[in-house]
Amino acid sequence: ECVTQLLKDTCFEGGDITTVFTPSAKYCQVVCTYHPRCLLFTFTAESPSEDPTRWFTCVLKDSVTETLPRVNRTAAISGYSFKQCSHQISACNKDIYVDLDMKGINYNSSVAKSAQECQERCTDDVHCHFFTYATRQFPSLEHRNICLLKHTQTGTPTRITKLDKVVSGFSLKSCALSNLACIRDIFPNTVFADSNIDSVMAPDAFVCGRICTHHPGCLFFTFFSQEWPKESQRNLCLLKTSESGLPSTRIKKSKALSGFSLQSCRHSIPVFCHSSFYHDTDFLGEELDIVAAKSHEACQKLCTNAVRCQFFTYTPAQASCNEGKGKCYLKLSSNGSPTKILHGRGGISGYTLRLCKMDNECTTKIKPRIVGGTASVRGEWPWQVTLHTTSPTQRHLCGGSIIGNQWILTAAHCFYGVESPKILRVYSGILNQSEIKEDTSFFGVQEIIIHDQYKMAESGYDIALLKLETTVNYTDSQRPICLPSKGDRNVIYTDCWVTGWGYRKLRDKIQNTLQKAKIPLVTNEECQKRYRGHKITHKMICAGYREGGKDACKGDSGGPLSCKHNEVWHLVGITSWGEGCAQRERPGVYTNVVEYVDWILEKTQAV
């Protein structure tokens, strides 16, 4: 059962796992949610009746029954983790805490103009978990405007004390606001020989990389595969760090793989969700339950629905035993990973999918696409919407993309002369325009947010957000697309598609069925040569065939240029402008979405 409200002046008795320090009960709840075992917590607020050394303590708790006895205690605030909830969860915490000093290892001290600048510095520093900033009213003259970057083993403060005229806050890496590079490559036959901060068991290098990503101190990792010569180290995932933030030594070793934390890419690839099945693999751990199940998929569902289950092993039924049902072993451990991994015993293992809700919805795999052809099939581009205007009569105006449950990203030029959002309708999950009848459900538009610097498409800043009046319930036919990570600026996308209901050629009519075309990206230098009379800026991205023939076309404005990278679709461009339609040596020009991620997040996350 999902309980989101906090219980004031209430303490949960017993079940303690560990104690951390958090600046608020709300953040204590987030920490509990992300902890592998925590189901409940008790936070102590500052209070004259409490010993100041207990202020800001966040006691993480577990219970076999998923609840604990409640005791009345002034200044105690208790609650439940969000593990039991189905809604999307985020560790992003933009709050600034006034007059609080969050203690940790002060590894960097510098002057900053404001707390915001200090927070940005922390966000763009690979080691920084949180910061404390002495304001210009701070009593000690030499400490004024000093920005202290801090880290700890846990990522949370080692203590929190009251201190006048300082402010503290957390790194915004988990808000997708870091400019740090996103290095997704996994390097085969490589060992990073730096200090280990932790080690866990993992079935493959990808799971190891994801574990590294949500471990607060891990910057890179080395994984020893099941073919690693030293048996005791097989399936071992070593979580590593270094002072420079990069591996100091790379050693060539067969059957080992190494890679980096994906903390700067976490909004556009899954980092919590281990959805694969591992055949002929047994995960060992504390046994929670043994249940009969028809298949390993059914076993994974049972694990996902059991809030304390972290991973499972399924042993298929022997011949006709037990109505063809196998045994499903639901398991857990102190850190969420198996204590040992065994091979060759016939089991099928995997992890709970409960953690998938901690990843962005946009990372969910969608159905395989149809190769060839120009007409799309249902569910192929579930983020694509058709934006209709009702004035003077109802018709398709522009495309757009779902990027959040209340947000559509589109082009600013779509709103030429549009004075009010009242004349707009957003239809999602649509394949054919003919499906749209008078009684077809749509989303009304509450607000049109056009980029402040937009003038005309060809000058850039051709980007707009639509805030919907109601929220989109995600299904197979309507779900969000990931924004590119700022750390992905140097990625070369090779699998890009433009979609829309636009004209297939100049002087055509809007197509009934959603059209698709695979289009190669063109460098900005090449694009500039094709548009000598225009300035192709870094905030634009171009795509098209040299010989022409395939392009976005009329009716596709605002629609997505979607690129698949590492099995996840990213909204790389917004169809903006071009000369004519699929003309030779005239690529389409798109708004380069990665350059507007900050703007998008600022507008969509505004309180």
């Epitope: 522009c398 030029h413 002369g417 056009i450 003038k455 903006s576």
Partner: antibody, heavy 118, light 111 residues
Framework: QVTLKESGPGILQPSQTLSLTCSFS??????????VSWIRQPSGKGLEWLAH???????RYKPSLKSRLTISKDTSRNQVFLMITSVDTADTATYYC??????????WGQGTLVTVSA | DIVLTQSPASLAVSLGQRATISCRAS??????????LNWFQQKPGQPPKLLIY???NLGSGVPARFSGSGSGTDFSLNIHPMEEDDTAMYFC?????????FGGGTKLEMK
């Protein structure tokens, strides 16, 4: 409601500099997306766009006249100005100032007639 | 510069009949979804008034007997049924690229 009013010298001689003022109300040139254009129309003829100024002081001119035109604004006084140097009889026209947001030329002033005569 | 050519230069239409004015652009005024072409009406001694924007959208307070259509380079303005009050000059104008340009105008009279 939105209103714009042009004012100018009425009559001037060739080679002089024409100074026009547009005073407006009902909108602000501090608003993102907002702009004001100058458009002229010789008697009985077509319309010719001359210059535009955006809220952020970015300016656009008709290329063939760019060297003679200067558009400027005083946001606090809700005024936009146009200067045309070295006028001749071909510059005789009614001059309109027009509000243009992120859409078409929506609101026009009544126009001011400028005659260039020796 | 984008050149707009209007035809006919003048037109006389009977009361209640249809008036059609054409506007042809020297290059496309479309931008993948919007036709940046507008129509204005101007009566003697008055400034122009916006009738149609983005090829087919009615300006504020414009009667429904006015309609616009077209895309790319070919556009038309239709008035049906023609009323006495519609006697005026009509101009098309493109907003695709600077310099913004106007057509030469069509004089519409009552037959």
């Amino acid at each position: 409601q939105v209103t714009l009013k042009e004012s100018g010298p009425g009559i001037l001689q060739p080679s002089q500099t024409l100074s026009l003022t547009c005073s407006f109300s009902g909108f602000s040139l501090n608003t993102s997306g907002m702009g004001v254009s100058w458009i002229r129309q010789p008697s009985g003829k077509g319309l010719e766009w001359l210059a535009h100024i955006y809220w952020d002081d970015d300016k656009r001119y008709k290329p063939s006249l760019k060297s003679r035109l200067t558009i400027s604004k005083d946001t606090s006084r809700n005024q936009v100005f146009l200067m045309i140097t070295s006028v001749d009889t071909a510059d005789t026209a009614t001059y309109y100032c027009v509000r243009k947001g992120r859409g078409p030329f929506a609101n026009w002033g009544q126009g001011t007639l400028v005659t260039v005569s020796a | 510069d984008i050149v707009l050519t209007q035809s006919p230069a003048s037109l006389a239409v009977s009361l209640g009949q249809r008036a059609t004015i054409s506007c042809r652009a020297s290059e496309s005024v479309d931008n993948y979804g919007i036709s940046f072409l507008n129509w204005f009406q101007q009566k003697p001694g008055q400034p122009p008034k916006l009738l149609i924007y983005a090829a087919s959208n009615l300006g504020s307070g414009v009667p429904a007997r006015f309609s616009g259509s077209g895309s790319g380079t070919d556009f038309s303005l239709n008035i049906h049924p023609m009323e006495e009050d519609d006697t005026a000059m009509y101009f098309c104008q493109q907003d695709k690229g600077v310099p913004w340009t106007f057509g030469g105008g069509t004089k519409l009279e009552m037959k």
